[in-house]
Every structure is written in structure tokens, then in C-alpha cells.
Interface confidence: medium
Amino acid sequence: ESGYAQNGDLEDAELDDYSFSCYSQLEVNGSQHSLTCAFEDPDVNTTNLEFEICGALVEVKCLNFRKLQEIYFIETKKFLLIGKSNICVKVGEKSLTCKKIDLTTIVKPEAPFDLSVIYREGANDFVVTFNTSHLQKKYVKVLMHDVAYRQEKDENKWTHVNLSSTKLTLLQRKLQPAAMYEIKVRSIPDHYFKGFWSEWSPSYYFRTPEINNSSGEMD
């Protein structure tokens, strides 16, 4: 779906790889949607390069992106959310490369927030809860969440749990006693919309109780 400049007056441009990727965020600011694109090669000289989206828009034929450092960005209510849009990298009026993209298939949800863990002594478990702004949205309401947790000393040994609700119970016996744990959560569209994992929520840290020697249980 990507192509390269064919014009003689764009010889320098022909040498570059203008591959890019994009993600959409629906109702990210009230009823406004956003679309963010960036070049896959971080060394691309973006001077004079512009992004434009055409088709599957409301009331207008095309929209130009704003440039924010190395990313290109649109915030608008004008995404039709039906069919494919044509997103092009341009120099002036000349298109260097284009992709046809359905914005409903590149949705990146907003990161979950308010992650917390509560220890229930009587139940010998930890109740993990978090919140997501998507519960209030019209479009991307149904998400799959990925809760990841690890013992703080085990840098890369993350345990992942997938769930559709915003509440998870971790059994005390599955965790090490008297240990500090880090936990975080991210979301991905599930159901009609498709796309990418959100950013991770801020991490939450909690400590497991020590083992009670008389009962073999944690304190």
C-alpha cells in the first residue's frame, strides 16, 4: 500500500522510505476524534513533508494534519467512520506515498487509569480495580484489558491476565509472601473496532503480607 515518488523533480525524495503508520482515537476529546501518524524510519527528513487524509470524511473532501515535532496529528469531528480513507505523505501537491485505511481498524484506546489493589484479609486475595474512559463512549465501548504484574525484583517476568471487565481477583497463594509487586493495565478494542494496545496505565505498587508461621498463611 505504500509507494514512492516517480517525478524527476523529486529525485532526493525517491531515495527515502516514507513508510508510515497511524492510529485513531475516537471521542478522545468529547465528540472529537484524533488521528496520529508517524514515519517508521525515525531518520526521515520531515522538512516540507505533509500528511493529508481524503475520503470517508464529513462535509469536507480532505483534511491536512498538524505537525507536532516528529508526529502528524488531526483532531476533528469529521471522520465518517465508514469505509476507507486515503492517507498520503505529500511534498507540496505531489504525493510520495499513500495508504488506504479504515479508521475503525486502527483504533488505539486511551490508557486505563485509577488502577488500585486492595488486600482482603478474610478472603486471602487481592482485588485489582481500574477505570477506563471508554465506558462512557458511544463508539469504542467494548475493550479487552491486559493486566500485567511482576515481582519488583523480576525485571522481565511479567504475568499477564486478559479480561473484559475492570475488576480482577488475584489469589494470595499465587503470589510470593512479603514481596513488592508492580501491576499495570492496558486495553485493546474488542468487538466491532480493531486496532492496537493502548499505552500502559501508570503502575501501581503493592506489598504482599508475610507468612503467618502458625497457619502457613500470609499476614
Epitope: G55, A56, V58, E59, L80, I82, G83, T104, Y139, Y192
Partner: antibody, heavy 121, light 109 residues
Framework: EVQLVESGGGLVQPGRSLRLSCAAS????????MHWVRQAPGKGLEWVSG????????GYADSVKGRFTIFRDNAKNSLYLQMNSLRAEDTALYYC??????????????WGQGTTVTVSS | AIQLTQSPSSLSASVGDRVTITCRAS??????LAWYQQKPGKAPKLLIY???SLESGVPSRFSGSGSGTDFTLTISSLQPEDFATYYC???????????FGQGTRLEIK
Amino acid sequence: EVQLVESGGGLVQPGRSLRLSCAASGFTFDDHAMHWVRQAPGKGLEWVSGISWNSRGIGYADSVKGRFTIFRDNAKNSLYLQMNSLRAEDTALYYCAKDEYSRGYYVLDVWGQGTTVTVSS
Amino acid sequence: AIQLTQSPSSLSASVGDRVTITCRASAGISSALAWYQQKPGKAPKLLIYDASSLESGVPSRFSGSGSGTDFTLTISSLQPEDFATYYCQQFNSYPLWITFGQGTRLEIK
């Protein structure tokens, strides 16, 4: 030339089934949502069903929900309407239509000539 | 679902007349409206999209206007080939849904 050709209509008894087909040519079929619209004799246009380019977005008129199924085969450039539990009020000329979202709002810019469905005992 | 009501249901006019057909939506639809022309025994033909944009190949005597709930189709100077039935159409993108007005039959006086 952009063209849509419907087929599969005919005379059918109430309660029976029929499958309509629409063969598309002259455009990139899998870039476009497609629709079925019907017109009963001497009546106005009634939207029946629509399907997005990738079949993930599907809608039905209340009058056919649960009885009709729309589906498409992008490899064959074809749109279908499976009509079950047919009723006398389903008697109509059935049109296949292509959307043209690139004009902004959703519009039906190409229509077939229609295929006639008659439900009668 | 949003309802579209066209008026009048039918009207008689003469060649050269200026004719206006209205379409009222039961709720605001911005400019999400299209107009079609249908002649007897033929498939509908797109005339206007985005409430006011003229489809390629459609004569400039056809024009559309309006936004929100009230829309009009105007034929500035009727020609013999314009006698037909006209429909307005609205859409909803999620869930997928299309609504047509009941039609306005334009006859020769």
C-alpha cells in the same frame, strides 16, 4: 464501466426462502460498503440492509431483521441477500447499490436495475 | 431511527417553472442528506449529496440547500425530462442505517 447486476428474484410462496445476488464490476469492490434497497409496486424506496467493505458493519431495516441476512464475497465481487420466512409484504423490486463515502456523507451513487421478488401462494 | 418527511407528496408544474421540494428530518443530521431522482421503470439516480453538492453529470438547474433538520431541492427551470419522483435520503454510520423520505412525485401540469 461501473456496473451492478442483480439476480435470483422470482415467485416464491410465503414462508419460503430466496437468495438474491449482485455481481459488481468496474470498481474496487472491497473498498465500498454495499446495500440492498427495495421498492414495492407503486411505493417508495425502502432501505433493506447494508454491509461495510469488510463485513464487520452490518445493518437491517426493522421490517426484515431476523429474517434476512446480508453477506458479501470480496473475492468474487459479489453481494448477497438471503431472505428467509418470506411474507407477502416482501414483494418488491430489489436493488443492489454501491456507497460512495469519498464524497463525504454516505450516498448511493451506483444502482443496479433490480430483480423482482414476488411472494404469493 | 431518524424519520424523513418530504413535502409535498406530489405536485404539478409546467416546463420552465421553478420547483422546490422540502425534506424535514425528525432530528438534526448536519448536512448528511442526499437527493435522488427516479423515473418510472428505472433505478434511482443520485443528484445531490452533502445536502448541497451536485453529483457529476447532473445539470446545474438542480440545487440543494439546508442543514440540521430542514432541506430543500430546487429545480430552477423545469425541463421535460425532470418529471419524475424525487427522494431524500439520510444515513447513520454506527450502527449502519439508511432512511429514505416517502418521495415527491413531480407531474406535468
